[in-house]
Protein backbone atom coordinates (compact mmCIF):
# COMPACT_ATOMS: atom_id res chain seq x y z
CA UNK A 1 0.00 0.00 0.00
CA UNK A 2 1.27 3.48 -0.81
CA UNK A 3 -0.02 7.04 -0.51
CA UNK A 4 -1.15 8.67 -3.76
CA UNK A 5 -1.98 11.96 -2.03
CA UNK A 6 -3.17 13.02 1.41
CA UNK A 7 -5.61 10.43 2.79
CA UNK A 8 -5.73 8.53 -0.54
CA UNK A 9 -3.97 5.16 -0.66
CA UNK A 10 -3.39 2.64 -3.43
CA UNK A 11 -3.54 -1.07 -2.63
CA UNK A 12 -1.64 -3.18 -5.16
CA UNK A 13 -3.67 -6.32 -5.64
CA UNK A 14 -2.40 -9.44 -7.40
CA UNK A 15 -5.82 -10.79 -8.35
CA UNK A 16 -6.90 -14.28 -9.34
CA UNK A 17 -9.96 -16.32 -8.35
CA UNK A 18 -9.65 -17.32 -4.68
CA UNK A 19 -6.67 -14.99 -4.16
CA UNK A 20 -6.21 -14.27 -0.44
CA UNK A 21 -5.96 -10.55 -1.12
CA UNK A 22 -3.85 -7.98 0.68
CA UNK A 23 -3.95 -7.36 4.40
CA UNK A 24 -4.18 -3.63 5.08
CA UNK A 25 -3.90 -1.90 8.46
CA UNK A 26 -5.60 1.50 8.68
CA UNK A 27 -4.70 3.88 11.49
CA UNK A 28 -7.05 6.60 12.70
CA UNK A 29 -5.32 9.99 12.55
CA UNK A 30 -6.20 11.13 16.07
CA UNK A 31 -4.65 11.39 19.53
CA UNK A 32 -7.76 9.61 20.86
CA UNK A 33 -7.27 6.02 21.99
CA UNK A 34 -10.69 4.77 23.10
CA UNK A 35 -14.22 4.63 21.74
CA UNK A 36 -13.18 4.70 18.08
CA UNK A 37 -15.33 2.93 15.48
CA UNK A 38 -14.87 2.39 11.72
CA UNK A 39 -17.31 2.53 8.79
CA UNK A 40 -17.03 2.23 5.01
CA UNK A 41 -18.51 4.86 2.68
CA UNK A 42 -22.10 5.84 3.52
CA UNK A 43 -22.85 2.66 5.43
CA UNK A 44 -23.54 2.91 9.15
CA UNK A 45 -22.43 -0.70 9.71
CA UNK A 46 -19.54 -0.75 12.19
CA UNK A 47 -16.60 -2.69 10.74
CA UNK A 48 -14.44 -2.63 13.84
CA UNK A 49 -13.33 -0.63 16.82
CA UNK A 50 -10.02 0.71 18.06
CA UNK A 51 -7.36 3.04 16.73
CA UNK A 52 -6.43 0.59 13.95
CA UNK A 53 -8.59 -1.46 11.60
CA UNK A 54 -7.21 -4.53 9.82
CA UNK A 55 -8.95 -5.47 6.59
CA UNK A 56 -8.41 -8.07 3.89
CA UNK A 57 -8.67 -6.40 0.48
CA UNK A 58 -9.70 -8.98 -2.12
CA UNK A 59 -11.82 -6.99 -4.58
CA UNK A 60 -13.31 -3.57 -5.33
CA UNK A 61 -16.07 -4.21 -2.82
CA UNK A 62 -13.38 -3.83 -0.12
CA UNK A 63 -12.18 -0.46 -1.46
CA UNK A 64 -13.69 2.93 -0.72
CA UNK A 65 -13.62 5.58 1.98
CA UNK A 66 -12.94 4.22 5.45
CA UNK A 67 -13.85 6.62 8.23
CA UNK A 68 -13.04 6.47 11.93
CA UNK A 69 -15.48 8.11 14.35
CA UNK A 70 -15.85 8.82 18.04
CA UNK A 71 -19.20 9.66 19.56
CA UNK A 72 -20.75 10.65 16.26
CA UNK A 73 -17.80 12.87 15.30
CA UNK A 74 -15.61 12.07 12.27
CA UNK A 75 -11.93 11.80 13.22
CA UNK A 76 -10.27 10.96 9.88
CA UNK A 77 -10.78 9.38 6.44
CA UNK A 78 -8.69 6.99 4.34
CA UNK A 79 -9.74 6.44 0.73
CA UNK A 80 -8.53 3.07 -0.57
CA UNK A 81 -8.11 2.60 -4.33
CA UNK A 82 -7.13 -0.65 -6.04
CA UNK A 83 -4.35 -1.13 -8.57
CA UNK A 84 -5.05 -4.57 -9.99
CA UNK A 85 -2.58 -6.99 -11.50
CA UNK A 86 -3.78 -10.11 -13.32
CA UNK A 87 -1.41 -12.76 -14.69
CA UNK A 88 1.49 -10.45 -13.85
CA UNK A 89 0.08 -7.56 -15.91
CA UNK A 90 -1.24 -4.32 -14.42
CA UNK A 91 -4.74 -3.48 -15.63
CA UNK A 92 -5.16 -0.97 -18.47
CA UNK A 93 -8.96 -0.68 -18.50
CA UNK A 94 -9.27 3.09 -18.27
CA UNK A 95 -7.43 4.17 -21.42
CA UNK A 96 -7.93 2.91 -24.94
CA UNK A 97 -5.05 1.32 -26.83
CA UNK A 98 -4.45 3.71 -29.76
CA UNK A 99 -2.40 0.99 -31.54
CA UNK A 100 -0.34 3.69 -33.27
CA UNK A 101 2.57 3.49 -33.85
CA UNK A 102 2.39 0.07 -32.15
CA UNK A 103 0.13 -2.02 -29.91
CA UNK A 104 -0.16 -1.00 -26.24
CA UNK A 105 0.22 2.70 -27.11
CA UNK A 106 -1.99 4.46 -24.57
CA UNK A 107 -0.26 7.86 -24.57
CA UNK A 108 0.70 9.73 -27.72
CA UNK A 109 2.87 12.83 -27.71
CA UNK A 110 3.88 15.43 -30.29
CA UNK A 111 6.07 18.55 -30.36
CA UNK A 112 5.77 21.37 -32.92
CA UNK A 113 9.43 22.38 -32.49
CA UNK A 114 12.56 21.84 -30.36
CA UNK A 115 11.64 24.32 -27.60
CA UNK A 116 10.97 21.55 -25.06
CA UNK A 117 7.21 22.09 -25.25
CA UNK A 118 5.09 19.07 -26.16
CA UNK A 119 1.51 17.83 -26.00
CA UNK A 120 0.36 14.35 -25.00
CA UNK A 121 -3.12 12.91 -25.46
CA UNK A 122 -5.04 9.75 -24.69
CA UNK A 123 -8.48 8.24 -25.29
CA UNK A 124 -11.12 6.72 -23.03
CA UNK A 125 -14.75 5.60 -23.32
CA UNK A 126 -15.38 6.59 -19.69
CA UNK A 127 -17.36 9.79 -19.17
CA UNK A 128 -17.74 10.14 -15.38
CA UNK A 129 -15.88 9.64 -12.08
CA UNK A 130 -12.56 10.04 -13.85
CA UNK A 131 -9.46 12.01 -12.86
CA UNK A 132 -5.97 12.29 -14.35
CA UNK A 133 -2.70 13.57 -12.95
CA UNK A 134 0.39 14.03 -15.13
CA UNK A 135 4.05 14.17 -14.15
CA UNK A 136 7.08 14.36 -16.40
CA UNK A 137 10.87 14.56 -16.23
CA UNK A 138 13.90 14.17 -18.43
CA UNK A 139 15.62 10.98 -17.35
CA UNK A 140 14.52 8.88 -14.41
CA UNK A 141 17.55 8.21 -12.21
CA UNK A 142 18.59 11.89 -11.84
CA UNK A 143 15.45 13.56 -13.25
CA UNK A 144 15.50 17.06 -14.70
CA UNK A 145 12.34 19.12 -14.44
CA UNK A 146 9.45 19.15 -16.86
CA UNK A 147 6.29 21.09 -15.91
CA UNK A 148 2.91 19.79 -17.05
CA UNK A 149 -0.44 21.55 -16.82
CA UNK A 150 -3.75 19.93 -15.94
CA UNK A 151 -5.18 17.34 -18.29
CA UNK A 152 -8.30 18.63 -20.04
CA UNK A 153 -11.02 17.08 -22.16
CA UNK A 154 -10.02 18.17 -25.67
CA UNK A 155 -12.44 16.28 -27.94
CA UNK A 156 -15.49 14.02 -27.98
CA UNK A 157 -16.39 11.76 -30.88
CA UNK A 158 -18.82 8.95 -31.61
CA UNK A 159 -17.36 5.62 -32.73
CA UNK A 160 -20.10 3.13 -33.57
CA UNK A 161 -22.24 2.70 -30.46
CA UNK A 162 -19.45 4.17 -28.35
CA UNK A 163 -18.61 7.69 -27.31
CA UNK A 164 -14.89 8.34 -27.13
CA UNK A 165 -13.27 11.10 -25.08
CA UNK A 166 -9.86 12.58 -25.82
CA UNK A 167 -7.85 14.20 -23.03
CA UNK A 168 -4.69 16.19 -23.55
CA UNK A 169 -1.98 17.88 -21.52
CA UNK A 170 0.76 20.37 -22.36
CA UNK A 171 4.22 20.06 -20.84
CA UNK A 172 7.33 22.24 -20.98
CA UNK A 173 10.88 21.22 -20.19
CA UNK A 174 12.13 23.67 -17.55
CA UNK A 175 15.64 24.17 -18.97
CA UNK A 176 15.30 23.16 -22.59
CA UNK A 177 18.26 23.46 -24.94
CA UNK A 178 16.80 23.24 -28.46
CA UNK A 179 20.14 22.75 -30.26
CA UNK A 180 21.51 20.12 -27.89
CA UNK A 181 21.72 16.43 -28.79
CA UNK A 182 19.35 14.55 -26.46
CA UNK A 183 20.90 11.70 -24.52
CA UNK A 184 18.21 11.12 -21.90
CA UNK A 185 14.57 10.62 -22.88
CA UNK A 186 11.58 12.54 -21.60
CA UNK A 187 9.44 10.38 -19.30
CA UNK A 188 5.71 11.07 -19.02
CA UNK A 189 3.63 9.41 -16.27
CA UNK A 190 -0.16 9.61 -16.11
CA UNK A 191 -2.08 8.53 -13.01
CA UNK A 192 -5.66 7.63 -13.89
CA UNK A 193 -8.42 7.06 -11.31
CA UNK A 194 -11.86 5.81 -12.28
CA UNK A 195 -14.18 5.35 -9.32
CA UNK A 196 -12.03 3.11 -7.05
CA UNK A 197 -9.67 1.90 -9.77
CA UNK A 198 -6.13 3.26 -10.04
CA UNK A 199 -3.98 2.75 -13.12
CA UNK A 200 -0.79 4.33 -14.36
CA UNK A 201 0.51 4.80 -17.86
CA UNK A 202 3.95 5.87 -19.03
CA UNK A 203 5.63 7.01 -22.22
CA UNK A 204 9.30 7.59 -22.91
CA UNK A 205 10.64 9.50 -25.93
CA UNK A 206 13.17 11.96 -27.29
CA UNK A 207 11.74 15.29 -28.48
CA UNK A 208 13.41 14.70 -31.87
CA UNK A 209 11.27 11.56 -32.35
CA UNK A 210 7.94 13.25 -31.64
CA UNK A 211 8.50 16.34 -33.79
CA UNK A 212 5.60 17.15 -36.10
CA UNK A 213 5.83 20.62 -37.62
CA UNK A 214 2.72 22.72 -38.19
CA UNK A 215 1.74 22.95 -41.88
CA UNK A 216 3.58 25.52 -44.03
CA UNK A 217 1.87 28.91 -43.91
CA UNK A 218 0.94 31.52 -46.49
CA UNK A 219 0.68 29.04 -49.37
CA UNK A 220 0.31 30.99 -52.63
CA UNK A 221 0.16 30.30 -56.38
CA UNK A 222 1.64 32.55 -59.09
CA UNK A 223 0.77 31.56 -62.67
CA UNK A 224 3.70 31.61 -65.10
CA UNK A 225 3.08 33.47 -68.39
CA UNK A 226 2.09 31.41 -71.44
CA UNK A 227 2.29 28.19 -69.44
CA UNK A 228 0.22 25.65 -67.50
CA UNK A 229 2.88 25.89 -64.83
CA UNK A 230 2.53 27.81 -61.58
CA UNK A 231 5.03 28.86 -58.99
CA UNK A 232 3.94 27.66 -55.57
CA UNK A 233 5.41 29.50 -52.61
CA UNK A 234 5.04 29.15 -48.85
CA UNK A 235 6.70 30.04 -45.57
CA UNK A 236 7.93 28.19 -42.52
CA UNK A 237 5.18 27.83 -39.88
CA UNK A 238 5.36 30.41 -37.09
CA UNK A 239 5.72 27.68 -34.48
CA UNK A 240 8.88 26.19 -35.99
CA UNK A 241 12.24 26.63 -34.20
CA UNK A 242 14.55 29.44 -35.24
CA UNK A 243 16.95 30.21 -36.83
CA UNK A 244 15.65 28.40 -39.92
CA UNK A 245 19.21 28.17 -41.26
CA UNK A 246 19.92 25.75 -38.39
CA UNK A 247 16.45 24.25 -37.80
CA UNK A 248 15.72 23.56 -41.45
CA UNK A 249 12.69 21.93 -43.00
CA UNK A 250 12.22 19.97 -46.19
CA UNK A 251 8.95 20.06 -48.11
CA UNK A 252 6.74 17.83 -50.21
CA UNK A 253 4.58 19.48 -52.87
CA UNK A 254 1.68 17.44 -54.24
CA UNK A 255 -0.72 18.07 -57.11
CA UNK A 256 -3.92 16.08 -56.57
CA UNK A 257 -6.85 15.83 -58.98
CA UNK A 258 -10.45 15.97 -57.79
CA UNK A 259 -10.66 12.17 -57.79
CA UNK A 260 -8.61 10.36 -55.16
CA UNK A 261 -7.87 7.73 -57.83
CA UNK A 262 -6.05 10.20 -60.07
CA UNK A 263 -2.28 9.97 -60.10
CA UNK A 264 -0.59 12.34 -57.66
CA UNK A 265 2.41 14.37 -58.80
CA UNK A 266 4.92 14.92 -56.01
CA UNK A 267 8.00 17.14 -55.79
CA UNK A 268 10.43 17.25 -52.84
CA UNK A 269 12.38 20.41 -52.16
CA UNK A 270 14.35 22.19 -49.46
CA UNK A 271 13.32 25.57 -50.85
CA UNK A 272 10.13 27.48 -50.01
CA UNK A 273 8.90 27.50 -53.60
CA UNK A 274 8.45 25.08 -56.48
CA UNK A 275 7.18 25.09 -60.04
CA UNK A 276 4.45 22.57 -60.86
CA UNK A 277 1.78 21.96 -63.51
CA UNK A 278 -1.66 22.98 -62.28
CA UNK A 279 -4.36 20.72 -63.73
CA UNK A 280 -7.99 21.84 -63.94
CA UNK A 281 -9.96 21.08 -60.73
CA UNK A 282 -6.75 19.95 -59.02
CA UNK A 283 -5.40 21.24 -55.72
CA UNK A 284 -1.85 21.86 -54.59
CA UNK A 285 -0.75 20.75 -51.14
CA UNK A 286 2.49 21.26 -49.26
CA UNK A 287 3.72 19.61 -46.07
CA UNK A 288 6.92 19.91 -44.05
CA UNK A 289 9.36 17.64 -42.24
CA UNK A 290 12.58 18.22 -40.32
CA UNK A 291 15.29 18.28 -42.98
CA UNK A 292 17.91 16.36 -41.03
CA UNK A 293 15.84 13.90 -38.97
CA UNK A 294 13.00 11.74 -40.27
CA UNK A 295 10.27 12.47 -37.74
CA UNK A 296 6.62 13.01 -38.73
CA UNK A 297 5.46 15.05 -41.69
CA UNK A 298 3.17 17.99 -40.93
CA UNK A 299 -0.45 17.97 -42.03
CA UNK A 300 -0.99 19.34 -45.55
CA UNK A 301 -1.59 23.01 -46.36
CA UNK A 302 -3.72 23.20 -49.53
CA UNK A 303 -4.94 25.65 -52.17
CA UNK A 304 -7.14 25.02 -55.25
CA UNK A 305 -5.54 25.36 -58.69
CA UNK A 306 -8.33 27.51 -60.14
Amino acid sequence: IWELKKDVYVVELDWYPDAPGEMVVLTCDTPEEDGITWTLDQSSEVLGSGKTLTIQVKEFGDAGQYTCHKGGEVLSHSLLLLHKKEDGIWSTDILKDQKEPKNKTFLRCEAKNYSGRFTCWWLTTISTDLTFSVKSSRGSSDPQGVTCGAATLSAERVRGDNKEYEYSVECQEDSACPAAEESLPIEVMVDAVHKLKYENYTSSFFIRDIIKPDPPKNLQLKPLKNSRQVEVSWEYPDTWSTPHSYFSLTFCVQVQGKSKREKKDRVFTDKTSATVICRKNASISVRAQDRYYSSSWSEWASVPCS
Epitope: G61, D93, K197
Partner: nanobody
Framework: EVQLVESGGGVVQAGESLRLSCAAS????????MGWFRQAPGTEREFVST????????YYADSVKGRFTISRDNAKNTVYLQMSSLKPEDTAVYYC????????????????WGQGTQVTVSS
Protein backbone atom coordinates in the same frame (compact mmCIF):
# COMPACT_ATOMS: atom_id res chain seq x y z
CA GLU B 1 -27.12 4.22 -21.20
CA VAL B 2 -27.17 0.42 -21.12
CA GLN B 3 -30.49 -1.45 -21.06
CA LEU B 4 -30.49 -4.96 -19.61
CA VAL B 5 -33.24 -7.57 -20.01
CA GLU B 6 -33.08 -10.90 -18.16
CA SER B 7 -34.81 -14.09 -19.30
CA GLY B 8 -34.78 -17.82 -18.62
CA GLY B 9 -36.23 -17.87 -15.11
CA GLY B 10 -38.85 -20.39 -14.07
CA VAL B 11 -39.86 -23.12 -11.65
CA VAL B 12 -37.64 -26.21 -11.35
CA GLN B 13 -37.12 -29.13 -8.99
CA ALA B 14 -34.15 -29.28 -6.64
CA GLY B 15 -31.13 -30.79 -8.41
CA GLU B 16 -32.21 -29.53 -11.84
CA SER B 17 -30.56 -26.90 -14.06
CA LEU B 18 -31.57 -23.57 -15.54
CA ARG B 19 -29.82 -21.10 -17.82
CA LEU B 20 -30.42 -17.37 -17.42
CA SER B 21 -29.66 -14.87 -20.18
CA CYS B 22 -29.21 -11.13 -20.04
CA ALA B 23 -29.39 -9.17 -23.29
CA ALA B 24 -27.79 -5.74 -23.35
CA SER B 25 -28.50 -2.85 -25.68
CA UNK B 26 -27.28 0.72 -25.84
CA UNK B 27 -23.67 1.65 -25.29
CA UNK B 28 -20.86 -0.78 -26.04
CA UNK B 29 -21.41 -3.98 -24.09
CA UNK B 30 -17.74 -4.97 -24.24
CA UNK B 31 -16.78 -1.93 -22.15
CA UNK B 32 -18.60 -3.35 -19.13
CA UNK B 33 -17.95 -5.96 -16.52
CA MET B 34 -21.17 -7.94 -16.06
CA GLY B 35 -22.59 -9.44 -12.89
CA TRP B 36 -25.48 -11.46 -11.52
CA PHE B 37 -27.11 -10.72 -8.18
CA ARG B 38 -30.16 -12.23 -6.51
CA GLN B 39 -32.71 -11.13 -3.95
CA ALA B 40 -35.02 -13.35 -1.94
CA PRO B 41 -38.06 -11.74 -0.25
CA GLY B 42 -37.14 -9.77 2.86
CA THR B 43 -33.39 -9.99 2.24
CA GLU B 44 -30.74 -7.69 0.75
CA ARG B 45 -29.52 -8.09 -2.80
CA GLU B 46 -26.82 -10.78 -2.78
CA PHE B 47 -23.85 -11.15 -5.12
CA VAL B 48 -23.80 -14.30 -7.27
CA SER B 49 -21.09 -13.92 -9.92
CA THR B 50 -19.28 -11.47 -12.18
CA UNK B 51 -17.29 -11.70 -15.42
CA UNK B 52 -14.66 -9.35 -16.84
CA UNK B 53 -15.28 -7.36 -19.99
CA UNK B 54 -13.31 -9.74 -22.23
CA UNK B 55 -14.71 -12.80 -20.48
CA UNK B 56 -11.27 -14.03 -19.41
CA UNK B 57 -11.85 -13.76 -15.64
CA UNK B 58 -14.75 -14.79 -13.43
CA TYR B 59 -15.59 -14.46 -9.74
CA TYR B 60 -18.24 -16.31 -7.70
CA ALA B 61 -19.91 -16.15 -4.32
CA ASP B 62 -18.90 -19.11 -2.15
CA SER B 63 -22.53 -20.26 -2.01
CA VAL B 64 -22.66 -20.97 -5.78
CA LYS B 65 -19.04 -21.93 -6.52
CA GLY B 66 -18.85 -25.19 -8.48
CA ARG B 67 -22.59 -25.12 -9.31
CA PHE B 68 -23.03 -21.91 -11.31
CA THR B 69 -21.05 -20.78 -14.37
CA ILE B 70 -21.06 -17.25 -15.76
CA SER B 71 -20.15 -16.60 -19.42
CA ARG B 72 -20.62 -13.90 -22.03
CA ASP B 73 -20.82 -13.51 -25.79
CA ASN B 74 -19.70 -10.01 -26.74
CA ALA B 75 -20.77 -10.54 -30.35
CA LYS B 76 -24.33 -11.13 -29.14
CA ASN B 77 -24.23 -8.55 -26.31
CA THR B 78 -25.37 -11.26 -23.90
CA VAL B 79 -24.24 -12.63 -20.55
CA TYR B 80 -25.36 -16.02 -19.26
CA LEU B 81 -25.67 -17.78 -15.91
CA GLN B 82 -25.75 -21.55 -16.11
CA MET B 83 -27.17 -22.86 -12.85
CA SER B 84 -26.96 -26.55 -12.02
CA SER B 85 -27.63 -28.67 -8.88
CA LEU B 86 -30.17 -26.05 -7.87
CA LYS B 87 -31.28 -25.91 -4.22
CA PRO B 88 -34.42 -24.43 -2.64
CA GLU B 89 -32.23 -21.71 -1.11
CA ASP B 90 -31.38 -20.51 -4.66
CA THR B 91 -34.99 -19.29 -4.97
CA ALA B 92 -34.88 -15.53 -5.66
CA VAL B 93 -35.27 -12.83 -8.27
CA TYR B 94 -32.04 -12.83 -10.32
CA TYR B 95 -30.74 -9.49 -11.57
CA CYS B 96 -28.19 -8.75 -14.26
CA UNK B 97 -25.92 -5.74 -13.75
CA UNK B 98 -23.25 -3.85 -15.70
CA UNK B 99 -20.36 -1.91 -14.18
CA UNK B 100 -16.75 -0.95 -14.71
CA UNK B 101 -15.02 -2.42 -11.66
CA UNK B 102 -13.94 -6.06 -11.79
CA UNK B 103 -14.16 -7.93 -9.51
CA UNK B 104 -16.75 -6.49 -7.18
CA UNK B 105 -19.45 -8.17 -5.12
CA UNK B 106 -20.89 -4.82 -4.03
CA UNK B 107 -24.15 -3.79 -5.76
CA UNK B 108 -23.38 -0.07 -5.79
CA UNK B 109 -20.25 -0.68 -7.90
CA UNK B 110 -22.60 -1.50 -10.80
CA UNK B 111 -24.10 1.28 -12.89
CA UNK B 112 -26.94 -0.42 -14.77
CA TRP B 113 -29.50 -3.02 -13.69
CA GLY B 114 -32.13 -5.20 -15.33
CA GLN B 115 -35.65 -5.71 -13.98
CA GLY B 116 -34.96 -9.27 -12.81
CA THR B 117 -36.23 -12.78 -13.56
CA GLN B 118 -37.82 -15.07 -10.96
CA VAL B 119 -36.21 -18.45 -10.21
CA THR B 120 -38.12 -20.83 -7.95
CA VAL B 121 -36.60 -24.12 -6.82
CA SER B 122 -39.05 -26.50 -5.21
CA SER B 123 -38.06 -29.44 -3.07
Amino acid sequence: EVQLVESGGGVVQAGESLRLSCAASGRSFSNYEMGWFRQAPGTEREFVSTISRRGSSTYYADSVKGRFTISRDNAKNTVYLQMSSLKPEDTAVYYCAAGQLFPSSRPRDYDYWGQGTQVTVSS
